[in-house]
């Protein structure tokens, strides 16, 4: 009669390389008496005998994965036990090899000149594929503006008209190569005023021609506003040449007025607008003298009516030709961008933009605006609108307006005063009085595990994007 013998694994498990959808086998040869029970684990979790993805044969000594998936990566162990001595174990790794696969291919993009475009190209494969890009028929070279990111996506900073064209990404590893379909990058250009109308001081009953020239892709349209309303009299002549539109408004002057040229073009569902104003005054008419830097007045606009404190005095910057009109246009343009952002970000961003463009004002000998407290700005930037912030900054720093006005609706947090310096010298935003049940998501940057009263759902992915390519990376 045979003597009992504790199990000994005579063939230790080794690392197995396998391609996706192929068969992978681990062998665990065991000598023992009586015959052992052999169990198998993957990443310390028992593989069930009835799991149809596996085949266990030769009294358990052979484990076969019938069709390898990329999720099968891991450490496999066999454990042999026959009741004599202790159980013995041998472990080996399964490395799933995979030909390159493009899991998120690039898509057609319309992007505005000067912004940042990101063409996605997310890949899978083992070994990790290298990603390169082709524009037209040539390999794309990286430079200070154009970079292939770690993720494989193509990032183009400060997009230029010459970046327009057809692109495809190429994923390559030792097992093969995958190509994406060709996608088109179209570059659009914000409406921009090349020549602003000039102000005139004329005698009663004179004729004046105001001229306004604008450029953009697509070609902008030009409209004229008189004292905030559509022009009621006068004749308009227009001509278009090489994406430049030239508009001339001829007026018979019987009263002074502020005439505003508005150039607009469309980018997808959104519009970009540039605006320039000129005054027509009549000689010897008196006009109100306003402070050279700015003045305090009640907010009479619509966009920020629900955000700003009722009847509060706000600062109007007289470096604009028509401050109230100009600032309202700036906020109106920014407001349109906010329609795309997450519900968490929107009220915070609205409060930030309104309080930045219409700062609380202390009247006096020198009207003084009160900027937002730095800490509140940072909270909007890094907690409420982490994903959206950079996209908005990109647009803001481009300067959508010319003729003495450029759009900078986003404050630079680091330049704002801190609450520590003088708590009364800066504005605290009113956006934070969220009811707890309304807070459903925080960007992942806030904390790895938030407190019990704020659920930490996935971060918002919306952005102030003009197109899917214009996003934060």
């Amino acid at each position: 009669e045979k003597l009992p013998k504790a199990p000994v694994i005579t063939t230790p498990l080794e690392t197995v390389d396998a391609l996706v959808e192929e068969v992978a086998t681990f062998m665990c040869a065991v000598e023992s008496y009586p015959q052992p029970e052999i169990s198998w684990t993957r990443n310390k979790i028992l593989i069930k005998l009835f799991d149809t993805r596996y085949s266990i044969r030769e009294n358990g000594q052979l484990l076969t994965i019938l069709s390898v998936e990329d999720s099968d990566d891991g450490i496999y162990c066999c454990i042999a036990n026959n009741g004599v001595g202790g159980a013995v174990e041998s472990c080996g790794a399964l490395q799933v090899k995979m030909k390159p696969k493009i899991t998120r291919p690039p898509i057609n993009v319309k992007i505005i000149e000067g912004l940042k475009a990101v063409l996605p190209c997310t890949t899978m494969g083992n070994p990790k594929p290298s990603v390169s890009w082709i524009k037209g028929d040539n390999a794309l070279r990286e430079n200070s503006r154009i970079a292939v990111l770690e993720s494989g996506s193509l990032r183009i900073h400060n997009v230029q008209k010459e970046d327009a064209g057809q692109y495809r990404c190429v994923a390559k590893n030792s097992l093969g190569t995958a190509y994406s379909k060709l996608v088109k990058l179209e570059v659009e250009v914000f409406a921009r005023i090349l020549r602003a109308p000039e102000s005139h001081n004329v005698t009663f009953g004179s004729f004046v021609t105001l001229r306004c020239t604008a450029i953009g892709i697509p070609v902008p349209t030009i409209s004229w506003i008189e004292n905030g309303n559509a022009v009621s009299s006068g004749s308009i002549q227009e001509s278009v040449k090489d994406r430049v539109i030239d508009s001339r408004l001829q007026l018979f002057i019987t009263k002074p007025g502020l005439y505003t040229c508005i150039a607009t073009n469309k980018h997808g569902e959104k519009f970009s607008t540039a605006k320039a104003a000129a005054t027509v005054s009549i000689a010897e008419w008196s006009k109100s003298q306003k402070d050279s830097q700015g003045y305090c007045a009640q907010y009479r606009g619509e966009v920020c009516d629900a955000v700003l404190a009722k009847d509060a005095l706000v600062f109007f910057n007289t470096s604009y030709r028509d401050p109230e009109d100009a600032q309202e246009l700036l906020i109106h343009t920014a407001w349109n961008e906010l329609k795309a952002v997450s519900p968490l970000c929107r009220p915070a961003a609205e409060a930030l933009l309104c309080n930045h463009l219409f700062q609380e004002c202390s009247p006096g000998v020198v009207p003084t605006p009160m900027p937002i407290c730095r800490e509140y700005c940072l909270a909007v930037k890094e907690l409420f609108c982490a994903k959206e912030w950079q996209a908005m900054e990109g647009k803001a720093h481009r300067g959508l307006y010319r003729s003495g006005m450029h759009l900078l609706p986003v404050p630079e947090c680091s330049k704002l005063p801190s609450m520590h310096r003088d708590p009364t010298a800066c504005t605290r935003l009113p956006y934070l009085d969220y009811k707890k049940e309304n807070i459903t998501t925080f960007p992942s940057i806030t904390s790895s595990r938030p407190s019990a009263d704020i659920p930490n759902l996935p971060a918002s992915t919306s952005s102030f994007a003009v197109s899917p390519a214009y996003s934060m990376t």
């Epitope: 800490e375 934070l432 940057i445 938030p450």
Partner: antibody, heavy 124, light 107 residues
Framework: EVQLVESGGGLVQPGGSLRLSCAAS????????IHWVRQAPGKGLEWVAS????????SYADSVKGRFTISADTSKNTAYLQMNSLRAEDTAVYYC?????????????????WGQGTLVTVSS | DIQMTQSPSSLSASVGDRVTITCRAS??????VAWYQQKPGKAPKLLIY???SLYSGVPSRFSGSRSGTDFTLTISSLQPEDFATYYC?????????FGQGTKVEIK
Amino acid sequence: EVQLVESGGGLVQPGGSLRLSCAASGFTVSSSSIHWVRQAPGKGLEWVASISSSYGSTSYADSVKGRFTISADTSKNTAYLQMNSLRAEDTAVYYCARSEGDRYVSGYSGLDYWGQGTLVTVSS
Amino acid sequence: DIQMTQSPSSLSASVGDRVTITCRASQSVSSAVAWYQQKPGKAPKLLIYSASSLYSGVPSRFSGSRSGTDFTLTISSLQPEDFATYYCQQSGVWLITFGQGTKVEIK
């Protein structure tokens, strides 16, 4: 002048309870956030709990969750830390500290004023 | 939870030396990082807030900076009163974590 004064520390047996108070002056607790931070003998600083009384929102470190409760009485301008089921490892100097603004911005302003601390000893 | 790994745990330096203390966050964090100085038997004092802003009344030889997940406190010229323990602190909405501390001793 901003001041925070803690009280209520002392010797307590394991399983026992204590209530720490943090009396504030020179600012209102309703417009700031109040935090409790502790320091075991010879060890580093450990955050315990925070409250933003204007919104009634609170937060706790995992090590005290379910045992400690932070609260504030704005009429008395005082914050409290109710400590139940005390353990030997809760022995420490407990500081209360404040930060400017509500819970969302307090992290950016830092803990700018601290009390002198009160010693809690949990021992049988 | 986010861990703040502070290094070194202690250092010896002389008056006039430039001293650098680093805190590395275990994952991406906001700039809600502060630095404190603590002397034996005393409460901590705020030096730097929002990663790089100098708290009022703190000497300008103290400065803070950020590079990705690394936060640095620099004392440009160590003074006798600077020998103490320094802590970094990170805030989420709310989850506050402190570094383990760095003891700055006289060489």
